[in-house]
Amino acid sequence: ELCDDDPPEIPHATFKAMAYKEGTMLNCECKRGFRRIKSGSLYMLCTGNSSHSSWDNQCQCTSSATRNTTKQVTPQPEEQKERKTTEMQSPMQPVDQASLPGHCREPPPWENEATERIYHFVVGQMVYYQCVQGYRALHRGPAESVCKMTHGKTRWTQPQLICTGEMETSQFPGEEKPQASPEGRPESETSCLVTTTDFQIQTEMAATMETSIFTTEYQ
């Protein structure tokens, strides 16, 4: 089932996520002047089992001016992650799979991809909100939204977040990233798909967010 709408818009807030539930699809979109190779996949699909999730298929773009003679081949995300691990042994290195079981990480970029990514999400996908620069959060409850299936219909829960422009300092408040808990989500409910752009991507964040150490500068 498709989620009927995009996640709720909160004034002066942005949302993002770091993991995608199995079943999520990502369209293979190419930037202007490029197109998918004829034999290429239409989308990537987050699949897996109880211990490992990864993106199936790979997106490949080629110049619209050529007739598929020069394919732009990009490694699959799992291959990309594995390659990076061997090159740089550091705790910064992303693992091959998402922190949460049954979830995929954000796929790395592919050659000549479009700026915006179009995702199709499944029921249970969470989105976490943050106030944009110049605004601070007033929490009434969880600053998150989840696609749920209720009585055969899908809906996005309303995040309990208000962003106010009264910034006391130029530094971001030490907001915490919500603890993503696999429990309590409609895992058993029917899958729901929704289309939205990457500027409205949905994800889950598994780790507690540390206090922001950044200050802001506008150009």
């Epitope: 990076k84 922190s99 991809e113 943050q130 944009v132 971001f172 500027f199 780790a207 967010m209 150490i213």
Partner: nanobody, 130 residues
Framework: QLQLVESGGGLVQTGGSLRLSCSTS????????IGWFRQAPGKEPEGVSY????????YYADSVKGRFTISSDNAKNTVYLHMNSLKPDDAAVYYC???????????????????????WGKGTLVTVSS
């Protein structure tokens, strides 16, 4: 294979300057925050700075604010980190990384976490002698 390539590291005396570069080919920075982490031996990675590909907003860690400047050359698909008044504490391996922007093309500093990046460079070593 898509990758981020850093350059510009080296040995510099305290108070000196360096300019690090992070370049790529095959994709544009439009949909990403692009910037730098650093890691000294035995220490946790530290977010240093980033710039957004959407509107060029820049962000800095308190430890480098006023000394480091990040900039980008979209025509060259390159991001630069200008490091002035370097201190021994700045010595580390500097890694370039990217992360997708949030909804509306926005990005907030609290997302700039080493565990969440989408793509990494191999790193470039910066040594500051006293």
């Amino acid at each position: 294979q898509l990758q981020l390539v850093e350059s510009g590291g080296g040995l510099v005396q305290t108070g000196g300057s360096l300019r690090l570069s992070c370049s790529t080919s095959g994709f544009t920075f439009d949909g990403y925050a692009i910037g730098w982490f650093r890691q000294a031996p035995g220490k946790e990675p530290e977010g240093v700075s980033y710039i957004t590909g959407s509107d060029g907003s820049t962000y800095y860690a308190d430890s480098v604010k006023g000394r480091f400047t990040i900039s980008s050359d979209n025509a060259k698909n390159t991001v630069y980190l200008h490091m002035n008044s370097l201190k021994p504490d700045d010595a580390a391996v500097y890694y370039c990384a990217i992360d997708r922007l949030g909804s509306g093309g926005a990005y907030v500093p609290i997302w700039w976490r080493s565990s969440d990046m989408d793509l990494w460079g191999k790193g470039t070593l910066v040594t500051v002698s006293s």
